[in-house]
């Protein structure tokens, strides 16, 4: 059961995480005015990824995208290729941890096969995790950077009567968005990899029945018990039934070969 | 047609509250945000502030913040502006004017009311 | 509050004549973020309310003649009519509509020689 729900909440937790770094690649909101020089504004200018946005007190909302490839900073390309790839990685890992589920029986698949790819959703849910925190930071760096470096603008050669307010930008809601996400992300890709463990065969089930040497009547109860093969198998982890109610997870699946702890 | 109907001229003494309506049709009124600004005679235009009529977020001129008071009434698609404390400086005509969606500019204005203060 | 100051604050000229006026503004009126001037030109006669002409220090409001013109970044603003018609004879505005509040200019009154 606790290997099911881990599996389960990992799957959960990951699809929250990817939906949650697509909605971020998307959003204008990367970077917002700071309004603390200029609260008066009736001009709102925010960022994204893809475009920038002025917001007018008058509702009317202007939008351009960036037109231009080659005349971007190369860190905001950085970070649109780390978003892009956190997408794709955990795009990819959906797909193959809803095959990798405990709780989907897909043909005759083998339960090592499910081990392996909850393992593989999970290292590409935390590489996009990763991707996407990476992603952020180094936004999030760059806009620090700017900002001191406009501030330092802001306070010098000012010595005319006009005055010239240079915009700064400070965080916007899609890097809290993006961190919340990557980290989600990357929780549910540990949660899988810990699943994996789990699931793993470290025995052989046999569905014969089980011969004890022992005169005492044991109850056969058919893929209830761990049968040792006798070849040096690691003992330490047989489980012992007591004949009492089983979790999900302890019951047989009878198309494949293994039961794993 | 886009028209801003206004209420009629006041004559007010020192002290007394005002309250100006300003009847918008034409356009849906909820969309829009509604201006007020007033001219003394023989000067130039002030600004007193704004309202939008679906949130009843105002935006006030900091020098009227404490005297002014915007508010509408949706169902009849009425803007008012009330102004208390008045004194023989408020002698003006004040007019309201609708946010043009856009640009930041009103685009119509109504035909103004006269206000008079005097003792 | 930026200080919005337009000159000449009078101005006689003849019909045909090409007139400009100026506003200068105490802080910059251009938003990085579009490259936008939000200044706007409003023209008022006598006894009416202003009408709107430019904005965006240069867009002209539909239904204004081609012979209005707006121009000018930052701080400094012109307004250009090109070849003055006797309806033109008003008092013109500049305004600020980037900070709060808005502010105008004291008008440019033209009037006829």
């Known amino acids: 059961m606790a290997v099911t729900a881990c599996q389960g909440l990992g799957f959960v937790v990951s699809l929250i995480g990817i939906a949650g770094i697509i909605a971020a690649t998307c959003m204008d909101q990367w970077s917002t005015q700071d309004l603390y020089n200029n609260p008066v504004t009736a001009v709102f200018n925010y960022q994204g990824l893809w475009r920038s946005c002025v917001r007018e007190s008058s509702g009317f909302t202007e939008c351009r995208g960036y037109f231009t490839l080659l005349g971007l900073p190369a860190m905001l390309q950085a970070v649109r290729a780390l978003m892009i790839v956190g997408i794709v990685l955990g795009a990819i890992g959906l797909l193959v941890s809803i095959f990798a589920l405990k709780c989907i029986r897909i043909g005759s698949m083998e339960d090592s096969a499910k081990a392996n790819m909850t393992l593989t959703s999970g290292i590409m849910f935390i590489v996009s995790g990763l991707c996407a925190i990476a992603g952020v930071s180094v936004f999030a760096n760059m806009l620090v950077t700017n900002f001191w470096m406009s501030t330092a603008n802001m306070y010098t050669g000012m010595g005319g009567m006009v005055q010239t307010v240079q915009t700064r930008y400070t965080f916007g809601a899609a890097l809290f968005v993006g961190w919340v996400a990557g980290g989600l992300t990357l929780i549910g890709g540990v949660m899988m990899c810990i699943a994996c463990r789990g699931l793993a065969p470290e025995e052989t089930n046999y569905k014969a029945v089980s011969y004890h040497a022992s005169g005492h009547s044991v109850a056969y109860k058919p893929g209830g018990f761990k049968a040792s093969t006798g070849f040096g198998s690691n003992t330490k982890n047989k489980k012992i039934y007591d004949g009492g109610a089983r979790t999900e997870d302890e019951v047989q699946s009878y198309p494949s070969k293994h039961d794993y702890v | 047609q886009v028209q801003l109907v206004q209420s009629g001229a006041e004559v007010k003494k020192p002290g007394a509250s005002v309250k100006l309506s300003c009847k918008a049709s034409?356009?849906?009124?909820?969309?829009?945000?509604m201006h007020w600004v007033r001219q003394a005679p023989g000067q130039g235009l002030e600004w007193i502030g704004m309202?939008?009529?679906?949130?009843?977020?105002?935006n006030y001129n900091e020098k009227f913040k404490s005297r002014a008071t915007l508010t509408v009434d949706t169902s009849t698609s009425t803007a008012y502006m009330e102004l208390s404390s008045l004194r023989s400086e408020d002698t003006a005509v004040y007019y309201c004017?609708?946010?043009?969606?856009?640009?930041?500019?009103?685009?119509?204005w109504g035909q103004g009311t006269t206000v008079t203060v005097s003792s | 509050d930026i200080v919005m100051t337009q000159s000449p604050s009078s101005l006689s000229v003849s019909v045909g004549d090409r007139v400009t006026m100026t506003c200068k503004s105490s802080?910059?009126?251009?938003?990085?973020?579009?490259?936008?001037?939000?200044l706007t030109w409003y023209q008022q006669k006598p006894g009416q309310p202003p009408k709107l002409l430019i904005y965006?220090?240069?867009t002209r409001e539909s239904g204004v003649p081609d012979r209005f013109s707006g121009s000018g970044s930052g701080t400094d603003f012109t307004l250009t009519i090109s070849s003055v018609q006797p309806e033109d004879f008003a008092t013109y505005y500049c305004?600020?509509?980037?900070?709060?509040?808005?502010?105008f200019g004291g008008g440019t009154k033209l009037e006829i020689k």
């Open positions: 004017a609708r946010r043009y969606y856009g640009s930041i500019s009103p685009d119509y």
């Open positions: 034409g356009y849906t009124f909820t969309s829009y945000w």
């Open positions: 309202i939008h009529p679906n949130s009843g977020s105002t």
């Open positions: 802080q910059s009126l251009l938003n990085s973020g579009n490259q936008k001037n939000y």
């Open positions: 965006w220090a240069s």
């Open positions: 305004q600020n509509d980037y900070s709060y509040p808005f502010t």
